[in-house]
Interface confidence: low
């Protein structure tokens, strides 16, 4: 067990604060909730502190909580590639680059870390070159959430990993809108950090509504589970 | 692609692609079929970098997708073969470790297609 993983034996609270600029609408958003690594289970309420979000809350989710992936439940035999908790207390700078297919693009950057025993996601994110009829700054895009796969493998140059994935975002009228991830953490702190092999995380995710909030918001609760290295995986590449 | 042909319904087919290098390493390698008047189905994957699996509902259990890293190749293992299982296979080499799962448009090359014809 890495010095950083026994911060995630139980349940651990989270605070996320987002800062947003996209297309020059700014907005702000604060997060409250809980993440039980055990289950690779996170639970989590968004309040647009500036009034209504100006973009859909589903294009914000992997900013969210694919941000606080040392959540997600890594089993036993694969515990060694656990990056994202053997960067903890010290934390990790998280930077994105995400491009929207035939519309603008998010950039952002977290630092998630321990302060105190919480685990915080403290995010910058600016958006550009947004059609303003779009997808995302016209809301066309459905209140939900699909799942996916988010590959990850080992940046040894910056003592971190790189991560890609797409995400597709259900649009009203029946299609999809993609979103093109291209990730990188690296770590905080100078202590050691466990480089993995090749493998991804596999996450589902549901959004909800709290009834009784009247502030635009979004409920959220998502399992991530790490996959794709078996037992005898070495056998694959003799 | 290799290993097209026909065979009876319960038989077994195994189909291999190889690509560049460059292209194999880290990539989501599909096989696709397309049968006449349909649309073009991605029925196996896999991500080169892992050998992480994708499977489409209707090959499921019956088909199986692996890699040889050493020589750049992926195959599908076709057994219990179906008359509807009749297209032209194509293998393709997706845009980025992503590509798994995602559909024709998520490929950036192609191979020329081998026959797979399966009678009852």
């Known amino acids: 067990m890495s010095k950083g993983e026994e911060l995630f034996t139980g349940v651990v609270p989270i605070l996320v604060e987002l800062d947003g600029d996209v297309n020059g609408h700014k907005f702000s958003v604060s997060g409250e909730g809980e993440g039980d690594a055990t289950y690779g289970k996170l639970t989590l309420k968004f309040i647009c502190t500036t009034g209504k979000l100006p973009v859909p809350w589903p294009t914000l989710v992997t900013t969210f909580s694919y941000g606080v992936q040392c959540f997600s439940r890594y089993p036993d035999h694969m515990k060694q590639h656990d990056f994202f908790k053997s960067a903890m207390p010290e934390g990790y700078v998280q930077e994105r680059t995400i491009f929207f297919k035939d519309d603008g693009n998010y950039k952002t950057r977290a630092e998630v870390k321990f302060e105190g025993d919480t685990l915080v996601n403290r995010i910058e994110l600016k958006g550009i070159d947004f059609k303003e009829d779009g997808n995302i700054l016209g809301h066309k895009l459905e209140y939900n959430y699909n799942s996916h796969n988010v590959y990850i493998m080992a940046d040894k140059q910056k003592n971190g990993i790189k991560v890609n994935f797409k995400i597709r975002h259900n649009i009203e009228d029946g299609s999809v809108q993609l979103a093109d991830h291209y990730q990188q953490n690296t770590p905080i702190g100078d202590g050691p950090v466990l480089l993995p092999d090749n493998h991804y995380l596999s996450t589902q995710s549901a959004l909800s509504k709290d009834p009784n909030e009247k502030r635009d918001h979004m409920v959220l609760l998502e399992f991530v589970t790490a996959a794709g290295i078996t037992h005898g995986m070495d056998e694959l590449y003799k | 692609e290799s290993g097209g042909g026909s065979v009876q319904a319960g038989g077994s087919l195994r189909l291999s692609c190889v690509v560049s290098?460059?292209?194999?390493?880290?990539?989501?390698m599909g096989w696709f079929r397309q049968a006449p008047g349909k649309e073009r189905e991605e029925v196996a994957s896999?991500?080169?970098?892992?050998?992480?699996?994708y499977y489409a509902d209707s090959v499921k259990g019956r088909f199986t997708v692996s890699q040889d890293n050493a020589k750049n190749t992926v195959y599908l293992q076709m057994n219990s073969l179906k008359p509807e299982d009749t297209a032209m296979y194509y293998c393709?080499?997706?845009?980025?470790?992503?590509?798994?799962?995602?559909?024709?448009?998520?490929?950036?090359?192609w191979g020329q297609g081998t026959q797979v014809t399966v009678s009852s």
């Open positions: 393709a080499a997706g845009r980025g470790s992503w590509s798994c799962g995602m559909g024709p448009d998520e490929y950036k090359y």
């Open positions: 896999i991500y080169t970098g892992g050998g992480i699996t």
């Open positions: 290098r460059s292209t194999y390493t880290s990539n989501c």
